[in-house]
Interface confidence: medium
Amino acid sequence: QGHLVHMTVVSGSNVTLNISESLPENYKQLTWFYTFDQKIVEWDSRKSKYFESKFKGRVRLDPQSGALYISKVQKEDNSTYIMRVLKKTGNEQEWKIKLQVLDPVPKPVIKIEKIEDMDDNCYLKLSCVIPGESVNYTWYGDKRPFPKELQNSVLETTLMPHNYSRCYTCQVSNSVSSKNGTVCLSPPCTLARSEQKLISEEDLGGEQKLISEEDLHHHHHH
């Protein structure tokens, strides 16, 4: 029994569920199930029968390879799919594919929780906010990654003058997509709250930046 394969795909995509080996020769019957009990399609006596299910109209079986094509998968399609084959000899065989459908991650928003000058050092606390997703976080300072131990939704660090960065990027990713959010401080660590302006990502070619009045003026003249 065995043959368990894991597949992770992005929601909205078209998916092919298939096995890595050849089907038994001249098999008698082939059935695809969704979880234990819901038949999706059955091939028997040279014809395919599609069952009433949430897949009807968006699945197709290739009896030659046993592949099941599903169009526009959604998160609700997460499940173990079972392909059951009855061989001519009477023996049965099954393959299982555990399908995980993930939404692409949304673009993160970076919030400045705290920024403070401390004797030439800069204490910085940034949070990377995305709506309730299970994701990985990677922080970059001027495109250099921060150490692994700082990789979570909040970046809390004390920077010294020799390693100040102007721009901070939070990259959120899951196994099917990744998106960046960037915030730029100018001058490093000395922003007065009253001077901050938030520029939309459209204004800055897809990057969200927090910049000073001076930078804003400069930006509009180029």
Epitope: Q1, G2, F36, S79, T80, L86, G90, N91, E94
Partner: antibody, heavy 117, light 107 residues
Framework: QVQLVQSGAEVKKPGASVKVSCKAS????????IHWVRQAPGQGLEWMGI????????RYAQKFQGRISMTWDTSTSTVFMELSSLKSEDTAVYYC??????????WGRGTPVTVSS | DIQMTQSPSSVSASVGDRVTITCRAS??????LAWYQQKPGKAPNLLIF???SLQSGVPSRFSGSGSGTDFTLTISSLQPEDFGTYYC?????????FGQGTKVEIN
């Protein structure tokens, strides 16, 4: 040799719950399905439900829906079946059966459960 | 749910006799049928799966046939150890359902 070893006999009062265990010796449950089947005295076999300890999927017969629960402890290769709100009609031998998905080619020895006031 | 109807409900035969038990499904189950033998106080034992495939270790005097809705278990030459109750079970869909059983007694 692969075996399904079940817990011992139980005597319960009406309204109580019973939890029967089924431990795999000789292999782990990864990728295997476990079914539960019961047999009342002098009666036939009645399918109760299925669990896949590997991915958490369960499916219960309509008759038991709402008062049956199948759980597992993968670290000890043990599956549990809990039946609540017991009635005298639940007096039966409870079997775990499994290994293959389509046919039960391995059975536990059965756990007798008596419901009596 | 798929109903499974077995007949006869009991049969009494002599050693060496040919015994036939039938099982009818309320809908087409292709070849997804299993036969079990159960002895008093014991768990069932798989004899036949996929309607006609003999489980390893089961004597060749047991055979199964049929597909769709009508199935047969045949014991070609009844032996003393073959007494017990025989059950068919559909394995096509959930819930799994069993026939009511056929009790085989040795004369």
């Amino acid at each position: 040799q692969v075996q399904l070893v079940q817990s011992g006999a139980e005597v319960k009062k009406p309204g109580a719950s019973v939890k029967v265990s089924c431990k795999a010796s000789g292999h782990t449950f990864t990728n295997y399905y476990i079914h539960w089947v019961r047999q009342a005295p002098g009666q036939g076999l009645e399918w109760m439900g299925i669990t896949n300890p590997n991915d958490g999927n369960t499916r219960y017969a309509q008759k038991f829906q709402g008062r049956i629960s199948m759980t597992w402890d993968t670290s000890t290769s043990t599956v549990f079946m809990e039946l609540s709100s017991l009635k005298s009609e639940d007096t039966a031998v409870y079997y775990c059966a499994g290994l293959r998905y389509w046919f039960f080619d391995l059975w536990g020895r059965g756990t007798p459960v008596t419901v009596s006031s | 749910d798929i109903q499974m109807t077995q007949s006869p409900s009991s049969v009494s035969a002599s050693v060496g006799d040919r015994v036939t038990i039938t099982c009818r499904a309320s809908q087409d189950i292709s070849s997804w049928l299993a036969w079990y033998q159960q002895k008093p106080g014991k768990a069932p034992n798989l004899l036949i799966f996929a309607a006609s495939s003999l489980q390893s270790g089961v004597p060749s005097r047991f055979s199964g046939s049929g597909s769709g809705t009508d199935f047969t278990l045949t014991i070609s030459s009844l032996q003393p150890e073959d007494f017990g109750t025989y059950y068919c079970q559909q394995t096509d869909n959930f819930p799994r359902t069993f026939g009511q059983g056929t009790k085989v007694e040795i004369n």
